[in-house]
Protein backbone atom coordinates (compact mmCIF):
# COMPACT_ATOMS: atom_id res chain seq x y z
CA UNK A 1 0.00 0.00 0.00
CA UNK A 2 1.38 3.42 0.85
CA UNK A 3 5.01 3.99 1.68
CA UNK A 4 5.87 7.18 3.46
CA UNK A 5 9.33 8.42 4.30
CA UNK A 6 9.83 9.11 7.97
CA UNK A 7 12.48 11.78 7.49
CA UNK A 8 14.60 12.35 10.58
CA UNK A 9 15.69 15.81 11.61
CA UNK A 10 18.79 16.82 9.70
CA UNK A 11 21.90 16.55 11.82
CA UNK A 12 25.28 18.08 11.08
CA UNK A 13 27.79 15.44 10.00
CA UNK A 14 29.85 13.73 12.65
CA UNK A 15 33.43 15.01 12.61
CA UNK A 16 35.75 12.80 10.66
CA UNK A 17 33.03 10.76 8.94
CA UNK A 18 32.15 13.12 6.13
CA UNK A 19 34.50 15.49 4.39
CA UNK A 20 33.76 19.06 3.52
CA UNK A 21 30.92 17.74 1.36
CA UNK A 22 29.38 15.88 4.27
CA UNK A 23 26.52 18.19 5.07
CA UNK A 24 25.45 18.40 1.45
CA UNK A 25 25.48 14.64 0.99
CA UNK A 26 23.44 14.19 4.14
CA UNK A 27 20.76 16.71 3.25
CA UNK A 28 20.30 15.71 -0.36
CA UNK A 29 19.43 12.04 0.20
CA UNK A 30 16.67 12.91 2.66
CA UNK A 31 15.15 15.46 0.32
CA UNK A 32 15.31 13.07 -2.61
CA UNK A 33 14.04 10.16 -0.57
CA UNK A 34 11.00 12.12 0.50
CA UNK A 35 10.20 12.94 -3.12
CA UNK A 36 10.93 9.46 -4.39
CA UNK A 37 8.44 7.70 -2.19
CA UNK A 38 5.58 10.18 -2.25
CA UNK A 39 2.58 8.45 -3.76
CA UNK A 40 0.17 10.04 -6.20
CA UNK A 41 -3.01 9.31 -8.10
CA UNK A 42 -4.12 9.31 -11.71
CA UNK A 43 -3.88 12.92 -12.76
CA UNK A 44 -4.72 14.90 -15.87
CA UNK A 45 -2.76 18.05 -16.66
CA UNK A 46 -3.93 20.80 -18.98
CA UNK A 47 -1.91 23.63 -20.48
CA UNK A 48 -3.50 26.43 -22.52
CA UNK A 49 -1.31 28.76 -24.51
CA UNK A 50 -2.06 31.69 -26.77
CA UNK A 51 0.25 31.94 -29.76
CA UNK A 52 2.25 35.14 -29.94
CA UNK A 53 2.05 35.22 -33.72
CA UNK A 54 -1.69 34.74 -34.08
CA UNK A 55 -3.75 36.26 -31.30
CA UNK A 56 -6.80 34.18 -32.14
CA UNK A 57 -4.78 30.96 -32.06
CA UNK A 58 -4.60 28.73 -29.00
CA UNK A 59 -2.65 25.58 -28.27
CA UNK A 60 -4.09 23.19 -25.72
CA UNK A 61 -1.86 20.43 -24.40
CA UNK A 62 -3.12 17.72 -22.09
CA UNK A 63 -1.62 14.63 -20.59
CA UNK A 64 -2.47 11.73 -18.35
CA UNK A 65 -0.27 10.56 -15.50
CA UNK A 66 -1.37 7.02 -14.83
CA UNK A 67 -0.47 3.40 -15.28
CA UNK A 68 -3.33 2.35 -17.51
CA UNK A 69 -3.86 2.31 -21.23
CA UNK A 70 -5.70 5.28 -22.69
CA UNK A 71 -8.75 4.35 -24.70
CA UNK A 72 -10.10 7.79 -25.61
CA UNK A 73 -9.29 11.48 -25.16
CA UNK A 74 -11.95 14.16 -25.47
CA UNK A 75 -11.15 17.88 -25.59
CA UNK A 76 -13.97 20.33 -25.01
CA UNK A 77 -14.45 23.99 -24.25
CA UNK A 78 -16.88 25.88 -22.10
CA UNK A 79 -16.71 23.26 -19.36
CA UNK A 80 -16.52 19.50 -19.19
CA UNK A 81 -18.04 17.51 -22.01
CA UNK A 82 -21.58 16.58 -21.06
CA UNK A 83 -21.90 19.47 -18.61
CA UNK A 84 -22.42 22.32 -21.05
CA UNK A 85 -19.10 21.89 -22.78
CA UNK A 86 -18.73 21.57 -26.53
CA UNK A 87 -16.48 18.91 -28.00
CA UNK A 88 -13.55 20.16 -30.04
CA UNK A 89 -11.73 16.91 -30.70
CA UNK A 90 -11.81 13.21 -29.96
CA UNK A 91 -8.63 11.16 -30.18
CA UNK A 92 -8.68 7.38 -30.22
CA UNK A 93 -5.39 5.46 -30.08
CA UNK A 94 -6.39 3.05 -32.87
CA UNK A 95 -9.32 4.54 -34.70
CA UNK A 96 -7.83 7.94 -35.26
CA UNK A 97 -8.68 11.54 -34.60
CA UNK A 98 -11.77 13.60 -35.24
CA UNK A 99 -11.96 17.33 -34.74
CA UNK A 100 -14.52 20.09 -35.17
CA UNK A 101 -14.01 23.75 -36.04
CA UNK A 102 -12.38 25.84 -34.75
CA UNK A 103 -9.95 23.01 -33.98
CA UNK A 104 -7.25 23.08 -36.62
CA UNK A 105 -4.92 20.27 -35.66
CA UNK A 106 -5.29 17.60 -33.01
CA UNK A 107 -2.51 15.10 -32.54
CA UNK A 108 -0.88 12.67 -30.14
CA UNK A 109 2.34 14.06 -28.71
CA UNK A 110 3.29 11.01 -26.68
CA UNK A 111 1.59 7.82 -25.56
CA UNK A 112 -0.17 9.79 -22.87
CA UNK A 113 -0.38 13.39 -24.05
CA UNK A 114 -2.09 15.25 -26.86
CA UNK A 115 -2.08 18.73 -28.33
CA UNK A 116 -4.76 20.69 -30.10
CA UNK A 117 -4.37 23.90 -32.07
CA UNK A 118 -7.42 26.14 -32.27
CA UNK A 119 -7.89 29.09 -34.53
CA UNK A 120 -10.75 31.22 -35.67
CA UNK A 121 -12.33 34.60 -35.72
CA UNK A 122 -15.68 35.95 -34.82
CA UNK A 123 -18.25 33.58 -33.44
CA UNK A 124 -16.05 30.51 -33.50
CA UNK A 125 -12.98 32.17 -31.97
CA UNK A 126 -11.88 31.19 -28.49
CA UNK A 127 -11.03 33.99 -26.12
CA UNK A 128 -8.84 34.41 -23.10
CA UNK A 129 -11.34 33.39 -20.44
CA UNK A 130 -12.57 30.28 -22.23
CA UNK A 131 -12.20 27.09 -20.21
CA UNK A 132 -10.76 24.07 -21.99
CA UNK A 133 -11.21 20.59 -20.57
CA UNK A 134 -9.49 17.30 -21.35
CA UNK A 135 -10.96 13.96 -20.45
CA UNK A 136 -8.88 10.79 -20.59
CA UNK A 137 -10.64 7.45 -20.51
CA UNK A 138 -8.22 4.83 -19.29
CA UNK A 139 -8.21 1.25 -18.09
CA UNK A 140 -8.15 0.44 -15.28
CA UNK A 141 -8.21 3.93 -13.77
CA UNK A 142 -11.37 5.10 -15.48
CA UNK A 143 -12.26 8.54 -16.84
CA UNK A 144 -10.39 11.52 -15.43
CA UNK A 145 -10.87 15.09 -16.51
CA UNK A 146 -9.21 18.42 -15.82
CA UNK A 147 -9.80 21.94 -17.07
CA UNK A 148 -7.66 24.97 -17.66
CA UNK A 149 -7.81 28.43 -19.16
CA UNK A 150 -5.52 31.32 -19.90
CA UNK A 151 -5.01 33.73 -17.04
CA UNK A 152 -7.07 36.85 -17.80
CA UNK A 153 -3.98 39.06 -18.13
CA UNK A 154 -1.99 36.64 -20.27
CA UNK A 155 0.41 38.08 -22.75
CA UNK A 156 0.48 36.35 -26.10
CA UNK A 157 3.02 33.56 -26.05
CA UNK A 158 2.60 32.87 -22.37
CA UNK A 159 0.98 29.68 -21.28
CA UNK A 160 -1.41 28.86 -18.52
CA UNK A 161 0.02 26.51 -15.94
CA UNK A 162 -0.78 22.85 -16.47
CA UNK A 163 -3.92 21.55 -14.74
CA UNK A 164 -6.80 23.84 -13.83
CA UNK A 165 -6.00 27.46 -13.12
CA UNK A 166 -7.53 27.42 -9.61
CA UNK A 167 -5.19 24.68 -8.48
CA UNK A 168 -1.63 25.61 -9.28
CA UNK A 169 0.53 25.35 -6.17
CA UNK A 170 2.16 21.99 -5.62
CA UNK A 171 0.67 20.55 -8.80
CA UNK A 172 2.72 22.95 -10.85
CA UNK A 173 5.87 22.27 -8.94
CA UNK A 174 5.21 18.57 -8.79
CA UNK A 175 4.17 17.83 -12.31
CA UNK A 176 6.47 20.25 -14.11
CA UNK A 177 9.52 20.63 -11.96
CA UNK A 178 9.94 17.58 -9.84
CA UNK A 179 9.36 14.81 -12.34
CA UNK A 180 12.51 15.59 -14.29
CA UNK A 181 14.65 16.14 -11.23
CA UNK A 182 13.32 12.94 -9.73
CA UNK A 183 14.55 10.72 -12.50
CA UNK A 184 18.07 11.94 -11.99
CA UNK A 185 17.64 12.39 -8.26
CA UNK A 186 16.42 8.94 -7.44
CA UNK A 187 19.26 7.37 -9.36
CA UNK A 188 21.68 9.71 -7.64
CA UNK A 189 20.14 8.81 -4.31
CA UNK A 190 20.83 5.14 -4.87
CA UNK A 191 24.39 6.02 -5.75
CA UNK A 192 24.78 8.08 -2.59
CA UNK A 193 23.26 5.43 -0.38
CA UNK A 194 25.61 2.84 -1.84
CA UNK A 195 28.58 5.10 -1.18
CA UNK A 196 27.52 5.70 2.39
CA UNK A 197 26.70 2.18 3.44
CA UNK A 198 28.28 2.77 6.80
CA UNK A 199 25.56 5.28 7.65
CA UNK A 200 22.22 3.74 8.68
CA UNK A 201 19.61 4.13 5.95
CA UNK A 202 16.25 5.68 6.88
CA UNK A 203 13.52 3.22 7.60
CA UNK A 204 10.52 3.16 5.31
CA UNK A 205 7.47 2.40 7.34
CA UNK A 206 4.26 1.26 5.72
CA UNK A 207 1.07 2.86 6.95
CA UNK A 208 -0.43 0.93 9.83
CA UNK A 209 -3.65 0.55 7.94
CA UNK A 210 -1.97 -0.99 4.95
CA UNK A 211 -3.72 -4.00 3.42
CA UNK A 212 -0.76 -4.57 1.15
CA UNK A 213 3.00 -4.72 1.30
CA UNK A 214 4.72 -1.34 0.99
CA UNK A 215 6.02 -0.34 -2.37
CA UNK A 216 7.92 2.83 -3.10
CA UNK A 217 7.76 4.40 -6.49
CA UNK A 218 10.59 6.39 -7.87
CA UNK A 219 8.95 8.45 -10.58
CA UNK A 220 6.04 10.26 -9.06
CA UNK A 221 5.73 13.99 -8.91
CA UNK A 222 5.42 15.08 -5.31
CA UNK A 223 1.91 16.11 -4.33
CA UNK A 224 2.48 18.29 -1.32
CA UNK A 225 -0.41 19.20 0.92
CA UNK A 226 -2.16 22.27 -0.31
CA UNK A 227 -5.18 24.37 0.43
CA UNK A 228 -6.35 24.49 -3.15
CA UNK A 229 -10.05 24.19 -3.75
CA UNK A 230 -10.92 22.48 -6.98
CA UNK A 231 -13.34 24.23 -9.30
CA UNK A 232 -14.06 21.84 -12.16
CA UNK A 233 -15.10 24.52 -14.59
CA UNK A 234 -15.39 28.23 -14.62
CA UNK A 235 -18.17 30.38 -15.97
CA UNK A 236 -17.17 31.71 -19.34
CA UNK A 237 -18.10 34.65 -21.45
CA UNK A 238 -20.75 33.17 -23.73
CA UNK A 239 -19.81 35.50 -26.56
CA UNK A 240 -16.65 33.45 -26.94
CA UNK A 241 -18.58 30.24 -27.46
CA UNK A 242 -18.95 29.03 -31.02
CA UNK A 243 -22.26 29.90 -32.57
CA UNK A 244 -22.49 27.08 -35.06
CA UNK A 245 -20.59 24.18 -33.59
CA UNK A 246 -22.44 20.91 -33.41
CA UNK A 247 -21.95 18.97 -30.22
CA UNK A 248 -20.08 15.79 -31.01
CA UNK A 249 -21.35 12.38 -29.99
CA UNK A 250 -18.22 10.27 -29.92
CA UNK A 251 -20.05 7.21 -28.62
CA UNK A 252 -22.73 7.19 -31.26
CA UNK A 253 -21.02 4.33 -33.02
CA UNK A 254 -17.72 3.48 -34.61
CA UNK A 255 -18.78 4.33 -38.14
CA UNK A 256 -17.25 7.81 -38.21
CA UNK A 257 -13.80 6.46 -37.43
CA UNK A 258 -13.90 4.41 -40.63
CA UNK A 259 -13.42 7.37 -42.91
CA UNK A 260 -10.18 8.35 -41.25
CA UNK A 261 -6.86 7.60 -42.90
CA UNK A 262 -4.89 4.94 -41.08
CA UNK A 263 -1.93 7.20 -40.43
CA UNK A 264 -4.19 9.42 -38.35
CA UNK A 265 -4.14 6.76 -35.69
CA UNK A 266 -0.37 6.69 -35.42
CA UNK A 267 1.21 7.62 -32.14
CA UNK A 268 4.91 7.88 -31.41
CA UNK A 269 6.06 4.47 -30.24
CA UNK A 270 9.60 4.81 -29.00
CA UNK A 271 11.50 7.23 -26.84
CA UNK A 272 13.05 8.88 -29.87
CA UNK A 273 9.65 9.92 -31.13
CA UNK A 274 8.66 11.13 -27.68
CA UNK A 275 11.82 13.17 -27.34
CA UNK A 276 10.89 15.14 -30.41
CA UNK A 277 7.77 16.45 -28.74
CA UNK A 278 7.51 20.16 -29.45
CA UNK A 279 7.71 22.37 -26.39
CA UNK A 280 6.18 25.85 -26.33
CA UNK A 281 8.91 28.24 -27.34
CA UNK A 282 8.19 31.06 -24.94
CA UNK A 283 6.16 29.27 -22.33
CA UNK A 284 6.61 30.70 -18.85
CA UNK A 285 5.25 28.52 -16.08
CA UNK A 286 4.39 30.69 -13.14
CA UNK A 287 4.21 29.16 -9.69
CA UNK A 288 1.75 31.02 -7.50
CA UNK A 289 2.96 29.90 -4.10
CA UNK A 290 6.30 28.28 -4.15
CA UNK A 291 8.09 30.68 -6.47
CA UNK A 292 9.77 27.76 -8.16
CA UNK A 293 10.43 29.46 -11.44
CA UNK A 294 11.04 33.04 -12.40
CA UNK A 295 8.00 34.59 -14.00
CA UNK A 296 9.52 35.97 -17.15
CA UNK A 297 11.49 34.14 -19.78
CA UNK A 298 13.04 31.53 -17.53
CA UNK A 299 11.55 28.10 -17.98
CA UNK A 300 11.53 25.18 -15.60
CA UNK A 301 13.42 22.01 -16.42
CA UNK A 302 10.80 20.67 -18.78
CA UNK A 303 11.14 16.91 -18.76
CA UNK A 304 7.56 16.16 -17.89
CA UNK A 305 4.81 16.27 -18.78
CA UNK A 306 5.76 17.15 -22.34
CA UNK A 307 8.84 15.03 -22.54
CA UNK A 308 8.91 11.56 -21.11
CA UNK A 309 12.14 9.78 -20.38
CA UNK A 310 10.59 6.38 -19.83
CA UNK A 311 11.24 4.01 -22.71
CA UNK A 312 8.33 1.74 -21.86
CA UNK A 313 5.46 2.65 -24.21
CA UNK A 314 3.02 2.42 -21.33
CA UNK A 315 4.71 5.34 -19.63
CA UNK A 316 6.31 5.89 -16.24
CA UNK A 317 4.16 3.56 -14.19
CA UNK A 318 4.93 0.54 -16.28
CA UNK A 319 7.86 -0.27 -14.04
CA UNK A 320 5.56 -0.96 -11.13
CA UNK A 321 3.74 -4.11 -10.18
CA UNK A 322 0.39 -5.01 -11.66
CA UNK A 323 -1.55 -2.84 -9.27
CA UNK A 324 -0.05 0.59 -9.87
CA UNK A 325 -0.30 3.21 -7.15
CA UNK A 326 -2.83 5.38 -5.50
Amino acid sequence: MRTEAQVPALQPPEPGLEGAMGHRTLVLPWVLLTLCVTAGTPEVWVQVRMEATELSSFTIRCGFLGSGSISLVTVSWGGPNGAGGTTLAVLHPERGIRQWAPARQARWETQSSISLILEGSGASSPCANTTFCCKFASFPEGSWEACGSLPPSSDPGLSAPPTPAPILRADLAGILGVSGVLLFGCVYLLHLLRRHKHRPAPRLQPSRTSPQAPRARAWAPSQASQAALHVPYATINTSCRPATLDTAHPHGGPSWWASLPTHAAHRPQGPAAWASTPIPARGSFVSVENGLYAQAGERPPHTGPGLTLFPDPRGPRAMEGPLGVR
Epitope: G40, T41, A137, G142, A146, I167, S207, T209, S225, G324
Partner: antibody, heavy 119, light 106 residues
Protein backbone atom coordinates in the same frame (compact mmCIF):
# COMPACT_ATOMS: atom_id res chain seq x y z
CA UNK B 1 -6.85 5.26 12.95
CA UNK B 2 -8.39 6.31 9.63
CA UNK B 3 -11.56 8.30 10.18
CA UNK B 4 -13.99 9.91 7.71
CA UNK B 5 -16.87 11.96 9.11
CA UNK B 6 -19.57 13.32 6.79
CA UNK B 7 -21.89 16.22 7.55
CA UNK B 8 -24.25 18.61 5.80
CA UNK B 9 -27.08 16.28 4.83
CA UNK B 10 -30.73 17.12 5.35
CA UNK B 11 -34.11 17.68 3.72
CA UNK B 12 -34.14 19.86 0.63
CA UNK B 13 -36.75 20.70 -2.00
CA UNK B 14 -36.37 19.65 -5.64
CA UNK B 15 -34.19 22.17 -7.46
CA UNK B 16 -32.47 23.11 -4.24
CA UNK B 17 -28.83 22.93 -3.22
CA UNK B 18 -26.85 21.33 -0.44
CA UNK B 19 -23.16 21.11 0.43
CA UNK B 20 -21.76 18.02 2.07
CA UNK B 21 -18.47 17.91 3.94
CA UNK B 22 -16.20 15.05 4.92
CA UNK B 23 -13.55 15.57 7.58
CA UNK B 24 -10.66 13.13 7.25
CA UNK B 25 -8.09 12.14 9.85
CA UNK B 26 -5.61 9.38 10.59
CA UNK B 27 -3.89 9.36 7.19
CA UNK B 28 -2.12 11.64 4.73
CA UNK B 29 -5.23 13.10 3.13
CA UNK B 30 -3.34 14.89 0.36
CA UNK B 31 -1.98 11.56 -0.93
CA UNK B 32 -5.30 9.93 -1.71
CA UNK B 33 -7.99 10.17 -4.33
CA UNK B 34 -11.31 10.66 -2.55
CA UNK B 35 -14.80 9.68 -3.64
CA UNK B 36 -18.43 10.28 -2.81
CA UNK B 37 -20.62 7.20 -3.05
CA UNK B 38 -24.34 7.18 -2.38
CA UNK B 39 -26.70 4.43 -1.31
CA UNK B 40 -30.25 4.76 -2.57
CA UNK B 41 -33.31 3.81 -0.48
CA UNK B 42 -33.32 0.56 -2.49
CA UNK B 43 -29.81 -0.08 -1.09
CA UNK B 44 -27.98 0.30 -4.41
CA UNK B 45 -24.50 1.82 -4.24
CA UNK B 46 -23.56 4.43 -6.85
CA UNK B 47 -20.36 6.37 -7.37
CA UNK B 48 -21.21 10.08 -7.40
CA UNK B 49 -17.85 11.81 -7.84
CA UNK B 50 -14.12 11.23 -7.60
CA UNK B 51 -11.31 13.71 -7.09
CA UNK B 52 -7.58 13.13 -7.37
CA UNK B 53 -5.27 13.81 -4.46
CA UNK B 54 -4.19 17.22 -5.76
CA UNK B 55 -7.74 18.27 -6.60
CA UNK B 56 -6.73 18.65 -10.23
CA UNK B 57 -8.59 15.80 -11.88
CA UNK B 58 -12.13 14.66 -11.41
CA UNK B 59 -14.78 12.24 -12.59
CA UNK B 60 -18.56 12.43 -12.49
CA UNK B 61 -21.05 9.91 -13.84
CA UNK B 62 -23.43 11.36 -16.42
CA UNK B 63 -26.45 11.53 -14.10
CA UNK B 64 -24.81 14.14 -11.84
CA UNK B 65 -22.46 15.89 -14.28
CA UNK B 66 -23.05 19.64 -14.30
CA UNK B 67 -25.11 19.48 -11.08
CA UNK B 68 -22.59 18.19 -8.55
CA UNK B 69 -19.13 19.58 -7.84
CA UNK B 70 -16.51 17.73 -5.81
CA UNK B 71 -13.70 19.71 -4.22
CA UNK B 72 -11.20 19.39 -1.44
CA UNK B 73 -9.12 21.48 0.93
CA UNK B 74 -5.96 19.55 1.65
CA UNK B 75 -4.90 22.03 4.34
CA UNK B 76 -8.09 21.30 6.25
CA UNK B 77 -8.20 17.58 5.38
CA UNK B 78 -11.71 18.07 4.10
CA UNK B 79 -13.62 16.83 1.07
CA UNK B 80 -16.75 18.57 -0.21
CA UNK B 81 -19.68 17.80 -2.46
CA UNK B 82 -21.69 20.76 -3.70
CA UNK B 83 -25.04 19.53 -5.00
CA UNK B 84 -27.38 21.77 -6.96
CA UNK B 85 -30.53 21.30 -9.05
CA UNK B 86 -31.36 18.40 -6.78
CA UNK B 87 -33.91 15.80 -7.91
CA UNK B 88 -35.94 13.29 -5.98
CA UNK B 89 -33.70 10.52 -7.33
CA UNK B 90 -30.75 12.12 -5.51
CA UNK B 91 -32.33 11.04 -2.23
CA UNK B 92 -29.78 8.73 -0.63
CA UNK B 93 -27.24 8.18 2.09
CA UNK B 94 -24.02 9.86 0.95
CA UNK B 95 -20.71 8.31 1.95
CA UNK B 96 -17.27 9.77 1.69
CA UNK B 97 -14.71 7.08 0.83
CA UNK B 98 -10.97 6.89 0.50
CA UNK B 99 -9.93 5.58 -2.89
CA UNK B 100 -6.89 3.34 -2.64
CA UNK B 101 -5.03 2.84 -5.92
CA UNK B 102 -2.92 0.03 -4.51
CA UNK B 103 -6.00 -2.13 -4.22
CA UNK B 104 -8.29 -0.44 -6.76
CA UNK B 105 -11.01 -0.14 -4.16
CA UNK B 106 -12.44 2.18 -1.53
CA UNK B 107 -10.76 0.94 1.60
CA UNK B 108 -12.28 3.31 4.16
CA UNK B 109 -15.78 4.77 4.31
CA UNK B 110 -17.41 7.36 6.52
CA UNK B 111 -20.61 6.74 8.47
CA UNK B 112 -22.67 8.62 5.87
CA UNK B 113 -24.96 11.63 5.83
CA UNK B 114 -28.57 11.41 4.69
CA UNK B 115 -29.95 13.61 1.90
CA UNK B 116 -33.68 13.70 1.23
CA UNK B 117 -35.02 15.61 -1.77
CA UNK B 118 -38.74 16.08 -1.41
CA UNK B 119 -41.37 18.77 -1.69
CA UNK C 1 -20.38 1.59 -18.11
CA UNK C 2 -19.73 -1.98 -17.10
CA UNK C 3 -22.72 -3.44 -15.29
CA UNK C 4 -22.36 -5.73 -12.28
CA UNK C 5 -25.04 -8.22 -11.32
CA UNK C 6 -25.09 -10.21 -8.11
CA UNK C 7 -26.92 -13.37 -7.21
CA UNK C 8 -28.77 -14.29 -5.23
CA UNK C 9 -30.35 -11.02 -4.18
CA UNK C 10 -30.95 -12.53 -0.77
CA UNK C 11 -30.30 -15.81 1.01
CA UNK C 12 -30.89 -17.33 4.41
CA UNK C 13 -28.35 -19.50 6.14
CA UNK C 14 -27.51 -20.79 9.58
CA UNK C 15 -24.42 -20.24 11.70
CA UNK C 16 -21.77 -22.79 10.73
CA UNK C 17 -22.97 -23.19 7.15
CA UNK C 18 -21.00 -22.29 4.03
CA UNK C 19 -22.42 -19.85 1.51
CA UNK C 20 -21.29 -18.56 -1.88
CA UNK C 21 -22.31 -15.28 -3.47
CA UNK C 22 -21.66 -14.69 -7.15
CA UNK C 23 -21.02 -11.53 -9.13
CA UNK C 24 -21.07 -11.18 -12.89
CA UNK C 25 -19.61 -8.34 -14.97
CA UNK C 26 -21.11 -7.34 -18.31
CA UNK C 27 -17.56 -7.12 -19.73
CA UNK C 28 -14.15 -8.48 -18.85
CA UNK C 29 -12.79 -6.68 -15.78
CA UNK C 30 -9.73 -8.92 -15.35
CA UNK C 31 -9.19 -9.19 -11.60
CA UNK C 32 -10.13 -5.61 -10.75
CA UNK C 33 -12.88 -6.63 -8.39
CA UNK C 34 -13.53 -5.84 -4.73
CA UNK C 35 -16.07 -7.08 -2.21
CA UNK C 36 -17.62 -5.09 0.64
CA UNK C 37 -19.68 -6.11 3.65
CA UNK C 38 -22.36 -3.84 5.08
CA UNK C 39 -24.08 -4.51 8.35
CA UNK C 40 -27.48 -3.06 9.16
CA UNK C 41 -27.28 0.69 9.78
CA UNK C 42 -23.53 0.81 9.11
CA UNK C 43 -21.32 1.89 6.23
CA UNK C 44 -19.72 -0.60 3.85
CA UNK C 45 -16.51 -2.28 4.99
CA UNK C 46 -13.70 -3.25 2.64
CA UNK C 47 -13.37 -7.03 2.46
CA UNK C 48 -11.57 -8.33 -0.63
CA UNK C 49 -9.54 -6.77 -3.45
CA UNK C 50 -7.97 -8.04 -6.64
CA UNK C 51 -10.81 -10.60 -6.72
CA UNK C 52 -9.20 -12.86 -4.13
CA UNK C 53 -6.93 -10.98 -1.71
CA UNK C 54 -8.36 -10.41 1.75
CA UNK C 55 -8.11 -6.92 3.18
CA UNK C 56 -6.23 -6.50 6.44
CA UNK C 57 -8.08 -7.97 9.41
CA UNK C 58 -10.60 -9.99 7.38
CA UNK C 59 -11.02 -13.54 8.79
CA UNK C 60 -9.71 -16.41 6.68
CA UNK C 61 -13.16 -17.99 6.47
CA UNK C 62 -13.80 -15.46 3.69
CA UNK C 63 -12.39 -16.23 0.25
CA UNK C 64 -12.77 -14.58 -3.11
CA UNK C 65 -12.31 -16.10 -6.52
CA UNK C 66 -12.82 -15.67 -10.23
CA UNK C 67 -11.56 -13.40 -12.99
CA UNK C 68 -12.80 -11.91 -16.22
CA UNK C 69 -16.57 -11.73 -15.86
CA UNK C 70 -17.41 -14.33 -13.18
CA UNK C 71 -16.54 -13.85 -9.53
CA UNK C 72 -17.51 -15.38 -6.22
CA UNK C 73 -17.29 -14.73 -2.51
CA UNK C 74 -17.35 -17.77 -0.28
CA UNK C 75 -17.90 -17.69 3.48
CA UNK C 76 -17.05 -20.89 5.32
CA UNK C 77 -18.53 -21.69 8.71
CA UNK C 78 -20.78 -18.62 8.99
CA UNK C 79 -20.49 -16.61 12.19
CA UNK C 80 -23.21 -14.38 13.67
CA UNK C 81 -21.23 -11.27 12.72
CA UNK C 82 -21.19 -12.28 9.04
CA UNK C 83 -24.85 -11.55 8.46
CA UNK C 84 -25.59 -8.41 6.48
CA UNK C 85 -25.30 -7.31 2.87
CA UNK C 86 -22.43 -7.96 0.46
CA UNK C 87 -21.55 -5.89 -2.58
CA UNK C 88 -19.11 -6.48 -5.40
CA UNK C 89 -17.47 -3.58 -7.22
CA UNK C 90 -15.32 -3.58 -10.32
CA UNK C 91 -12.59 -1.09 -11.01
CA UNK C 92 -11.80 -1.69 -14.64
CA UNK C 93 -12.64 1.85 -15.55
CA UNK C 94 -14.75 3.91 -13.19
CA UNK C 95 -16.13 1.82 -10.37
CA UNK C 96 -19.64 0.38 -10.44
CA UNK C 97 -21.27 -1.81 -7.83
CA UNK C 98 -23.38 -4.92 -7.91
CA UNK C 99 -26.94 -4.75 -6.61
CA UNK C 100 -26.01 -6.47 -3.35
CA UNK C 101 -26.79 -9.76 -1.67
CA UNK C 102 -28.56 -9.75 1.66
CA UNK C 103 -27.44 -12.60 3.90
CA UNK C 104 -29.92 -13.33 6.66
CA UNK C 105 -29.99 -15.75 9.56
CA UNK C 106 -32.25 -18.72 8.94
Amino acid sequence: EVKLVESGGGLVQPGGSLKLSCAASGFTFSSYTMSWVRQTPEKRLELVAELSNSGGSFHYPDNVKGRFTISRDNAKNTLYLQMSSLKSEDTAMYYCARHNWDVYAMDYWGQGTSVTVSS
Amino acid sequence: DIQMSQSPASLSASVGETVTITCRASENVNSYLAWYQQKQGRSPQFLVYNAQTLAEGVPSRFSGGGSGTQFSLKINSLQPEDFGSYYCQHHYGNPTFGGGTKLEIK
